[in-house]
């Protein structure tokens, strides 16, 4: 049998089983989810789960630049450190950088400080790029 | 191992189009960026644009957005460049390079010459 | 788009000489490569990320720098480093070269 790989929305590009699409816009969070969102496809912002898949949308990323943080799907909606992925997936994998995680900062971004593999709150009103995923 | 291969060298009519090619074998194709800098004989290094093969999404320098096409055929692991309107301006050696965040090495291939004469 | 301007355009060194030359950018950038060529030959590789030396390549070269200026030294030159040294800034698209220094 030949198993045919699904295919992503054009622009967007497939890894184990999802479609990513990077959006140089500016948004803030929820208007950056929103926007995922409206892409359909039951999109999200992303979650990230492992090393590898961190490791494969940074390479992506990299095409475009190396100097902006990307807004990503894993926020505090309680303010109380209880940090959950917006479409619902398994908070296991963690890669904080060292900063601190303090003050009004309540969502997450790549940080460009490590070729995106680390991640750092921040304000949730901040404009950003971001980060959409969905499983086709 | 990782190899790009490119023919030596073209030669075209003004006003003509190409194609040129680099042929990627050694590395999963559609998970790292190709990249296409120009080089006038004598000249510097000049960035085009690159591409992502598994999305095929594009970014160029704006002074090629007009002159240059890049596309990918993932059968073959083959990335194209189009050069369109072709003057003696165009003359070059034209790379195509493999991106790599984490690589201590990159890769290029060996250059075509492209020659614009009539 | 970054443009990036290298000094001195053209250089000579005797053996044994520290040698350094420059990148500027006409804005501040988070990272910057060198390549080396040498006539008739592709490009490759020879620092990236501002500091680390790519594979193969002595110790005795190092990259240095932050926001819009970079340099590239070589602590005591070797026949062998004579060619031509490009940076590229790899921090926002186009990712621009350098015109060159010329070794």
């Known amino acids: 049998d030949i198993i045919m790989r699904p295919s992503c929305a054009p622009g967007w590009f497939y890894h184990k089983s999802n479609c990513y699409g990077y959006f140089r816009k500016l948004r803030n969070w929820s208007d950056a989810e929103l926007e995922c969102q409206s892409y359909g496809n039951g999109a999200h912002l992303a979650s990230i789960l492992s090393l590898k898949e961190a490791s494969t949308i940074a390479e992506y990323i990299s095409g475009y630049q190396r100097s902006q943080p990307i807004w990503i799907g894993l926020h505090d909606p309680q303010k109380r450190q209880q940090w959950q992925w917006i479409d619902g997936a398994m908070y296991l994998y963690r890669s904080w950088s060292g900063k601190s995680m303090g003050g009004n900062k309540h969502c997450a971004e790549m940080s460009s400080n490590n070729n995106f593999l680390t991640w750092s709150s921040n304000e949730c009103n901040k404009r950003q790029h971001f980060l959409c995923k969905y499983r086709p | 191992q990782v190899q790009l291969q490119q023919p030596g060298s073209e030669l075209v009519r003004p006003g003509a189009s190409v194609k040129l090619s680099c042929k990627a074998s050694g590395y999963t194709f559609t998970s790292y960026w190709m990249h296409w800098v120009k080089q006038r004989p004598g000249q510097g290094l000049e960035w085009i644009g690159n591409?992502?093969?598994?999305?095929?999404?594009?970014n160029y320098d704006e002074k090629f957005k007009s002159k240059a096409t890049l596309t990918v055929d993932t059968s073959s692991s083959t990335a194209y460049m189009q050069l369109s309107s072709l003057t003696s301006e165009d003359s070059a050696v034209y790379y195509c390079?493999?991106?790599?965040?984490?690589?201590?090495?990159?890769?290029w291939g060996q250059g075509t010459t492209l020659t614009v004469s009539s | 788009q970054i443009v990036l301007t290298q000094s001195p355009a053209i250089m000579s060194a005797s053996p044994g000489e520290k040698v350094t030359m420059t990148c500027s950018a006409s804005s501040s950038v988070s990272y910057m490569h060198w390549y080396q060529q040498k006539s008739g030959t592709s490009p490759k590789r020879w620092i990236y990320?501002?500091?680390k030396l790519a594979s193969g390549v002595p110790a005795r070269f190092s990259g240095s720098g932050s926001g819009t200026s970079y340099s590239l030294t070589i602590s005591s030159m070797e026949a062998e480093d004579a060619a031509t040294y490009y940076c590229q800034q790899w921090s926002s698209n186009p990712f621009t070269f350098g015109s060159g220094t010329k070794l």
């Open positions: 390079t493999r991106g790599g965040l984490w690589l201590r090495v990159d890769y």
């Open positions: 990320d501002t500091s």
């Open positions: 591409i992502y093969p598994g999305s095929g999404s594009t």
